[in-house]
């Protein structure tokens, strides 16, 4: 590895209301001749690990997490590895943790706190 | 390039407690990244014991939660290592590692005995 | 927790020939949470494959991993001298992160 990629989330809690979609805001800085077919994505419940949502091998590999997930396609090769969470339910209540791997890899998590 | 260097004592007395930390050259500590601990022993294989992030936040192995802690140290860049109540079970070479999924690098690993 | 199970124990092979490991889960997984590693004798393990079959910086094309649900497979296709080894599959799809018992190539 030539250095972690860095990650960037929000440091305060995303509040949403239950029923309305969240957006779980996560980012990284791809390099000079970055291409989406070296990036793996991985959403998961950062305590459990279990897949939420991925991006692998230059594809959307979908929702793991009852179907109600989805990525930004279109802003990714920009860096912008948000996720989509629709119809928040107060089970969705915690951490998810945004993994990036490129060359190297780094993590970082974001709290969702339901109202 | 990230490295990693455990470093310790060899030997614990039993009921003691196993102190290691491992020094982390190359790059900062505050990265994106989560700094693990992981076990080797003849009879149980590689055994993941617990990881921290730059913030503070750790998980543990729920087979060993309630004798590890994990901290953190940004000025030292370096992150440690305390299992209490040992036993000779706990005889192992300890390997400090980094990730949250896979691991990737490894410090190259300290034995540790546990013995009287 | 999820219980990983390699086999065969011990593969007895010659320089040249192919090699086929496998690792079993316990429980289904999602095949990007599963990883290779390889570990010689005095030496920590060396990341070889990440999310079933992306090889790490570094690693040799002759390695390659596939598998789905429970049923994961590391091949190297042409081993190498440098190639015989003790290799672990490790699961992150479930916490605590788990690793298999171990696979020993060695030279017949």
């Known amino acids: 590895p030539t250095g972690a990629v860095e990650v960037q989330v929000p440091e305060d809690p995303v509040v949403a209301l239950v029923g309305t979609d969240a957006t779980l805001r996560c980012s990284f800085s791809p390099e000079p001749g970055f291409s989406l077919a070296q990036l793996n994505l991985i959403w998961q419940l950062t305590d459990t690990k279990q897949l939420v949502h991925s991006f692998t091998e230059g594809r959307d590999q979908g929702s793991a997490y009852a179907n109600r997930t989805a990525l930004f396609p279109d802003l990714l090769a920009q860096g912008n590895a948000s996720l989509r969470l629709q119809r928040v339910r107060v089970a969705d209540e915690g951490s998810f943790t945004c993994f990036v791997s490129i060359r190297d890899f780094g993590s970082a998590a974001v709290s969702l706190q339901v109202a | 390039q990230v490295q990693l260097q455990e470093s310790g004592p060899g030997l614990v007395k039993p009921s003691g407690t196993l102190s290691l930390t491992c020094a982390v050259s190359g790059g900062s500590i505050s990265t994106s990244n989560w700094w693990n601990w992981v076990r080797q022993s003849p009879g149980k294989g590689l055994e993941w014991i617990g990881e921290?992030?730059?913030?503070?936040?750790?998980n543990y192995s729920p087979s060993l939660k309630s004798r590890v802690t994990i901290s953190i140290d940004k000025s030292k860049n370096q992150f440690s290592l305390k299992l209490n109540s040992v036993t000779a079970a706990d005889t192992a070479v300890y390997y400090c590692?980094?990730?949250?999924?896979?691991?990737?690098?490894w410090g190259q690993g300290t034995l540790v005995t546990v013995s009287s | 927790e999820i219980v990983l199970t390699q086999s065969p124990g011990t593969l007895s092979l010659s320089p040249g020939e192919r090699a086929t490991l496998s690792c079993r889960t316990s429980q289904s997984i999602n095949g990007i949470l599963l990883a290779w590693y390889q570990q010689k004798p005095g030496q920590a393990p060396r990341l070889l494959i990440y999310g079933a079959s992306s090889r790490a910086t570094g690693i040799p094309d002759r390695f390659s991993g596939s598998g789905s649900g429970t049923d994961f497979t590391l091949s190297i296709s042409r081993l190498e001298p440098e190639d015989f080894a003790v290799y672990y599959c490790?699961?992150?799809?479930?916490?605590?992160?788990?690793f298999g018992q171990g696979t020993k190539v060695e030279i017949k």
């Open positions: 590692a980094r990730g949250y999924n896979w691991f990737d690098p």
């Open positions: 921290i992030y730059p913030t503070g936040n750790t």
């Open positions: 490790q699961q992150y799809g479930s916490s605590p992160r788990t």
